[in-house]
C-alpha cells in the first residue's frame, strides 16, 4: 500500500480541476502543490469540493502563507471563505472593493457572521474611513450595517457617503447614532431645495435639534407621525403648539392616537391647555 504521505503514481495534480473531487483527503494533501492552488484559486469555487476537502486546501494555503493570504488569493476564496476564522482574517490586508464584494457574496442572504464582521472591520480600517462606495456595498448586503457601528465609528463617515444611505439602513439606529449622522446628513443635503431636502433628511431627523425642527416647521413639510415619534424628546419639548401644527400639517390629527407615548405625552404636558385646545383634538395637558 502506498504510504499516505506520498502521492500515488500518476496522481500529482497538474491543474486544479474537477478530477480532484475524487481525491481522498490525504491524496489532496500529498498531490496538490500549494503554489499551484494559490495561482488557480479562481477555479476552486467552481468545483464542488466537500467541506473536508476544503479543510485540506485551506491547510495548504495556511502553510504557504503563514503571515496571511495575499489579496490575489483572498479575492477568489469563494466557499473557502466560510472556513476562515476571524483570527485568519485579521492577518489579511484587503484593499480592493471587488475583493470585499466577492466575499460578501458568499455569505449573501444570511446574517453577518463573525468572519464577515472581521473582514469589514479590516477593510474599513485599511481605508481609513467609510467612503461612499464602501458604504453603498455594505448597506446593499447588510441594510442594518450602519446601525451596528458605534457613534465613534460613525464619526469617520464623511458627509459625502450619506448619499448612499437609504431609509431602511437607519431602521435600527438608536438616538446616539442619529446624533452623529444627522449633522453629516444636514451638510450633505444642504444645497437641496425645501421639499427635496425634507425627503432626504427625514430618516435622519431622530438626531435633529430644536432649532432645526423649528426651521422645518416654516417650510410646509407635513411630517408624518412615524417620523415625529422618532424625534428626540428634548428637541420636541420646546416646540410651541403652532410650530408642531405647522410641522405636521394634515398629520396633526395623529397626535391624539399617540398622546400616551413619548415624545407626544411629554410635549403635551409642557403646553398651556388653551394652546392645546386650538388643535381641537381633545388633548389634555
Amino acid at each position: 500500500e502506498v504510504e499516505k504521505t506520498a502521492c500515488p503514481s500518476g496522481k500529482k495534480a497538474r491543474e486544479i480541476d474537477e478530477s480532484l473531487i475524487f481525491y481522498k483527503k490525504w491524496e489532496l494533501e500529498a498531490c496538490v502543490d500549494a503554489a499551484l492552488l494559490a495561482t488557480q484559486m479562481d477555479r476552486v469555487n467552481a468545483i464542488p469540493f466537500t467541506y473536508e476537502q476544503l479543510d485540506v486546501l485551506k491547510h495548504k494555503l495556511d502553510e504557504l502563507y503563514p503571515q496571511g493570504y495575499p489579496e490575489s488569493v483572498i479575492q477568489h476564496l469563494g466557499y473557502l471563505f466560510l472556513k476562515m476564522s476571524p483570527e485568519d482574517i485579521r492577518k489579511w490586508n484587503v484593499t480592493s472593493l471587488e475583493t470585499l464584494k466577492a466575499l460578501l457574496e458568499v455569505n449573501k442572504g444570511h446574517e453577518m457572521s463573525p468572519q464577515v464582521a472581521t473582514l469589514i472591520d479590516r477593510f474599513v480600517k485599511g481605508r481609513g474611513q467609510l467612503d461612499k462606495d464602501t458604504l453603498d456595498t455594505l448597506t446593499a448586503f447588510y441594510p442594518g450595517y450602519l446601525c451596528s457601528l458605534s457613534p465613534e465609528e460613525l464619526s469617520s463617515v464623511p458627509p459625502s457617503s450619506i448619499w448612499a444611505v437609504r431609509p431602511q439602513d437607519l431602521d435600527t439606529c438608536d438616538p446616539r447614532q442619529l446624533d452623529v449622522l444627522y449633522p453629516k446628513a444636514r451638510l450633505a443635503f444642504q444645497n437641496m431645495n425645501g421639499s427635496e431636502y425634507f425627503v432626504k433628511i427625514q430618516s435622519f431627523l431622530g438626531g435633529a435639534p430644536t432649532e432645526d425642527l423649528k426651521a422645518l416647521s416654516q417650510q410646509n413639510v407635513s411630517m408624518d407621525l412615524a417620523t415625529f415619534m422618532k424625534l428626540r424628546t428634548d428637541a420636541v419639548l420646546p416646540l410651541t403648539v403652532a410650530e408642531v401644527q405647522k410641522l405636521l400639517g394634515p398629520h396633526v390629527e395623529g397626535l391624539k392616537a399617540e398622546e400616551r407615548h413619548r415624545p407626544v405625552r411629554d410635549w403635551i404636558l409642557r403646553q398651556r391647555q388653551d394652546d392645546l385646545d386650538t388643535l381641537g383634538l381633545g388633548l389634555q395637558g
Epitope: 464542488p48 466557499y79 466560510l82 449573501k108 444570511h110
Partner: nanobody
Framework: QVQLQESGGGLVQPGGSLRLSCAAS????????MGWYRQPPGNERELIAI???????VYRDTVKGRFTIRRDNAKNMVYLQMNNLKSEDTGVYYC????????????WGQGTQVTVSS
C-alpha cells in the same frame, strides 16, 4: 434538508447493467450537488459521480464511459445507470445530497447493495 432512499441494487453478472434510483423526500432543485458514493467491501466510501444543479455529470476515472448520472429535479429523483459492470464495482451504493455555502448540509441515503459476480 432532505431524506434520501435508494433502490435498484442487486446481483448482476460481469458485463451486465443496473439502474439505481434515489428518491428525495423534498425538492432537490435548489440543492447544489447530488451524487453517488460507493463503499467496496473492506474499504472506505468513495465518490463515484456527481450532478450539479444543471444536471452536468462528473465521474470518477474508473467508471467514466460506463456509468451515467441523471438528475430529475421535477420528480426529485437521481439515477445512476451502470453498464458493463465489473467485479470491482461491487459495494454498497449511497445517494448523497450536498448544499454548498452558508446554511450548508449533507444528507445520505441508507445505501443499496450491488454485487457483480458470475
Amino acid at each position: 434538508q432532505v431524506q434520501l432512499q435508494e433502490s435498484g441494487g442487486g446481483l448482476v453478472q460481469p458485463g451486465g447493467s443496473l439502474r439505481l434510483s434515489c428518491a428525495a423526500s423534498g425538492s432537490i432543485s435548489k440543492i447544489a450537488i447530488m451524487g453517488w458514493y460507493r463503499q467496496p467491501p473492506g474499504n472506505e466510501r468513495e465518490l463515484i459521480a456527481i450532478a450539479n444543479m444543471t444536471g452536468t455529470g462528473v465521474y470518477r476515472d474508473t467508471v467514466k464511459g460506463r456509468f451515467t448520472i441523471r438528475r430529475d429535479n421535477a420528480k426529485n429523483m437521481v439515477y445512476l445507470q451502470m453498464n458493463n459492470l465489473k467485479s470491482e464495482d461491487t459495494g454498497v451504493y449511497y445517494c448523497h445530497a450536498r448544499q454548498l455555502g452558508v446554511g450548508s448540509f449533507e444528507s445520505w441515503g441508507q445505501g443499496t447493495q450491488v454485487t457483480v459476480s458470475s
